[in-house]
Interface confidence: low
């Protein structure tokens, strides 16, 4: 009897045979007839003759990727009644081998990606009554193979990405009632017919990224089960009101890298499963979007608009928000963010904010990062940060502060105050037990972190006159002990980098004289 595993292949006890990358020019012989999985990918098999696999009646998985295959005999795969997976990607096929695959009634997954396929014969997928996954991406298709796809009512995932498709006709996928995932990214799609997605009642993921769409794809209204929608990197300028009215289950929308100028105020309302919303550079938008019914947002980014105010009830409705980026707008007044308990990051840089009230950030018990830089802030209430127990990074640089409250900021790792030229008071190191990085308006304000404060270990200027860093021992004083352990850092020492440096020729003694 022939050996169970013929050289140069390797076999395991699970009836799997690996002959990949062995320089084979033909299907290997001498293998067990009971083989269930055969991997002959990455070889030099350029054609498959008739009955190439007649000795493998129990084959369930056949991998033929990366072989420069250009010809498959119509009867090359005959007899493979158990075959569930067939991978033919990265070959030289110019057409779908419709005859060869016709009898594969058990086939569930078919990979034809990364070939040179320009045509899909009308009868291509007839008889594939169990096919669930079909890869046709990275070929040279210029249109959706509408008729062949109509043979696949069991299909769950289809990718036609990375082709040269320029338009999609009405009812292109109408028979694919089981389809859950459809990838059409990286084509040249300029237009979608109004009814092109009709019949895709179970579609959950639609990827239209990297195409040439210049209008919002209204055809998505026919997709009631849609959860993930991508149309980033297109040429869409307007998202109309009611854009997603037919897609109440949307969880994710990727729309960045579109030249958006306008977004309908109610475009994103009633999307109760939406977790993330990113709108950048919609320069004609003046009002904060109506997010009524869209109550599970975890991340909201609205930047580069003309929005001048934030709704007072934002945090009554958006209790799940973790990150909020409202930078580069015209916001003047801030509401109380109380209620946004999960908020960890807020960016409000480059707005027109002038005042931070005591209640503005109250209740943000999870806030870690707050960026208020490049506003017009003149005053921050003394208790504004008092309850921000977790804040580690605070940027209030380039504002108009004359004083700066430190209550509640004991856990800061990074603080930026540079550019507040009316802020002349010295800071006390004991107020910042965990500080690693500090930027201040004036060099002398670094001195307290350079060796003046009793909390800090003196690091004399002989050691490193240029690099104004100081090593602070944890637990050096009772004050430090009160904030030690896990509410502080993992290391026993922390290096503080403070800018602007006083420099070698203007040490702290020179800047502060006898005060030191």
């Amino acid at each position: 009897a022939p050996p169970l595993c013929a050289a140069p292949c390797s076999c395991d006890g699970d009836r799997r045979v690996d002959c990949s990358g062995k320089g084979l020019t033909a299907v290997p012989e001498g293998l067990s007839a009971f083989t269930q999985a055969l991997d002959i990918s990455m070889n030099n098999i350029t054609q498959l003759p008739e009955d190439a696999f007649k000795n493998f009646p129990f084959l369930e998985e056949l991998q033929l990727a990366g072989n420069d295959l250009s010809f498959i005999h119509p009867k090359a795969l005959s007899g493979l009644k158990e075959l569930k997976v067939l991978t033919l990607q990265n070959n030289q096929l110019k057409t779908v081998p419709s005859e060869a695959i016709r009898g594969l009634s058990a086939l569930q997954s078919l990979r034809l990606d990364a070939n040179h396929i320009t045509s899909v014969p009308e009868d291509s997928f007839e008889g594939l009554v169990q096919l669930r996954h079909l890869w046709l991406d990275d070929n040279i298709l210029t249109e959706v193979p509408v008729r062949p796809l109509s043979n696949l009512p069991t299909l769950q995932a289809l990718t036609l990405a990375l082709n040269n498709i320029s338009s999609i006709p009405d009812f292109a996928f109408t028979n694919l009632s089981s389809l859950v995932v459809l990838h059409l990214h990286n084509n040249k799609i300029k237009s979608l017919s109004q009814h092109c997605f009709d019949g895709l009642d179970n579609l959950e993921t639609l990827d239209l990224n990297y195409n040439n769409l210049d209008e919002f794809p209204q055809a998505i209204k026919a997709l009631p089960s849609l959860k993930e929608l991508g149309f980033h990197s297109n040429s869409i300028s307007v998202i109309p009101d009611g854009a997603f009215a037919g897609n109440p289950l949307l969880r994710t929308i990727h729309l960045y890298d579109n030249p958006l100028s306008f977004v309908g105020n109610s475009a994103f309302h009633n999307l109760s499963d939406l977790h993330s919303l990113v709108i950048r550079g919609a320069s004609l938008v003046q009002w904060f979007p109506n997010l009524a019914g869209t109550v599970h947002l975890e991340s909201l980014t609205l930047t580069g608009t003309k929005i001048s105010s934030i709704p007072d009830d934002l945090c009554q409705n958006q209790k799940m928000l973790r990150t909020l980026d409202l930078s580069y707008n015209d916001i003047r007044d801030l509401p109380s963010f109380n209620g946004c308990r999960a908020l960890e990051e807020i960016s409000l840089q480059r707005n027109q904010i002038s005042l931070i009230k005591e209640t503005t950030f109250q209740g943000l018990t999870s806030l870690r990062i707050l960026d208020l830089s490049r506003n017009l802030i003149r005053e921050i209430h003394s208790g504004a940060f008092a309850k921000l127990g977790t804040i580690t990074n605070l940027d209030v640089s380039f504002n108009e502060l004359t004083s700066f409250p430190t209550e509640g900021l004991n856990g800061l790792n990074q603080l930026k105050l540079v550019g507040n030229f009316q802020l002349k008071d010295a800071l006390a190191a004991r107020d910042f037990a965990n500080l690693r990085s500090l930027s201040v308006p004036y060099a002398y304000q670094c001195c307290a972190f350079w060796g003046c404060d009793s909390y800090a270990n003196l690091n004399t200027e002989d050691n490193s006159p240029q690099d104004h860093s100081v090593t602070k021992e944890k637990g050096a004083t009772d004050a430090a002990n009160a904030t030690s352990t896990a509410e502080s850092e993992e290391h026993s020492q922390i290096i503080i980098h403070c800018t602007p440096s006083t420099g070698a020729f203007k040490p702290c003694e020179y800047l502060l004289g006898s005060w030191m």
Epitope: A342, T365, S366, G389, T390, A482, T485, A486, E487, E490
Partner: antibody, heavy 119, light 106 residues
Framework: QVQLQQSGAELVKPGSSVKISCKAS????????IHWIKQQPGNGLEWIGW????????EYNQKFNGKATFIADKSSSTADMQLNSLTSEDSAVYFC????????????WGQGTLVTVSS | DIQMTQSPPVLSASVGDRVTLSCKAS??????LDWYHQKHGEAPKLLIY???NLQTGIPSRFSGSGSGTDYTLIISSLQPEDVATYYC????????FGTGTKLELK
């Protein structure tokens, strides 16, 4: 040094209520969150919720809504948890723990209070 | 709720061994994870916070790593006093503890 001292073990009847105390010392009581954690015999840990003594703000794990109620007394630096409508499922050790933020790490723990519900 | 599955449930190792404990989340928890150990009859004790930060006073033989859904606690050289049940804890949303790994001496 920071300490969380919990009240003693309780033996209570089904249907009744019980109040467990957690007395804090060695730090500013109003500046940290007090969390409550449940551990049934031989089982893992389950987060019940927290109270911020500074303003009495609370948050509960949905599973314990209506079962647990937190209160904090600033004057005595004590946090209490009341458990209502007790059943055998509530028999467990209950821990209080301190954190600087609403959810993150618990650097200090009480020693635990055993509650036994039995008729 | 996010489920936290620890493996193995029970682990036997010898003094001096390098021990690896695993914690898998049912979804991405963005490194919002701590490790605790609990000795019999005692309260849990914090070892590692925010995935890889060693709590003050904890020996450096303990270290943590991970991202996304997969997290690991390593004890580089097991000591007798490390015998305990180890719990991971995620606070990315709706805080939950892991199922626990009981570490025993061989």
């Amino acid at each position: 040094q920071v300490q969380l001292q919990q009240s003693g073990a309780e033996l209570v009847k089904p249907g009744s209520s019980v109040k467990i105390s957690c007395k804090a010392s060695g730090y500013t009581f109003t500046s940290y969150f007090i969390h409550w954690i449940k551990q049934q015999p031989g089982n893992g840990l389950e987060w019940i919720g927290w109270i911020y003594p500074g303003d009495g703000d609370t948050e509960y794990n949905q599973k314990f809504n209506g079962k647990a109620t937190f209160i904090a007394d600033k004057s005595s630096s004590t946090a209490d948890m009341q458990l209502n409508s007790l059943t055998s499922e509530d028999s467990a050790v209950y821990f209080c723990a301190r954190s600087k933020s609403a959810y993150n790490w618990f650097a200090y723990w009480g020693q635990g209070t055993l509650v036994t519900v039995s008729s | 709720d996010i489920q936290m599955t620890q493996s193995p449930p029970v682990l036997s190792a010898s003094v001096g061994d390098r021990v690896t404990l695993s914690c898998k989340a049912s979804q991405n928890i963005n490194k919002n994870l701590d490790w605790y150990h609990q000795k019999h009859g005692e309260a849990p004790k914090l070892l590692i916070y925010y995935t890889n930060n060693l709590q003050t006073g904890i020996p450096s033989r303990f270290s943590g790593s991970g991202s996304g859904t997969d997290y690991t606690l390593i004890i580089s050289s097991l000591q007798p006093e490390d015998v305990a049940t180890y719990y991971c804890y995620q606070y990315n949303s709706g805080p939950t503890f892991g199922t626990g790994t009981k570490l025993e001496l061989k």
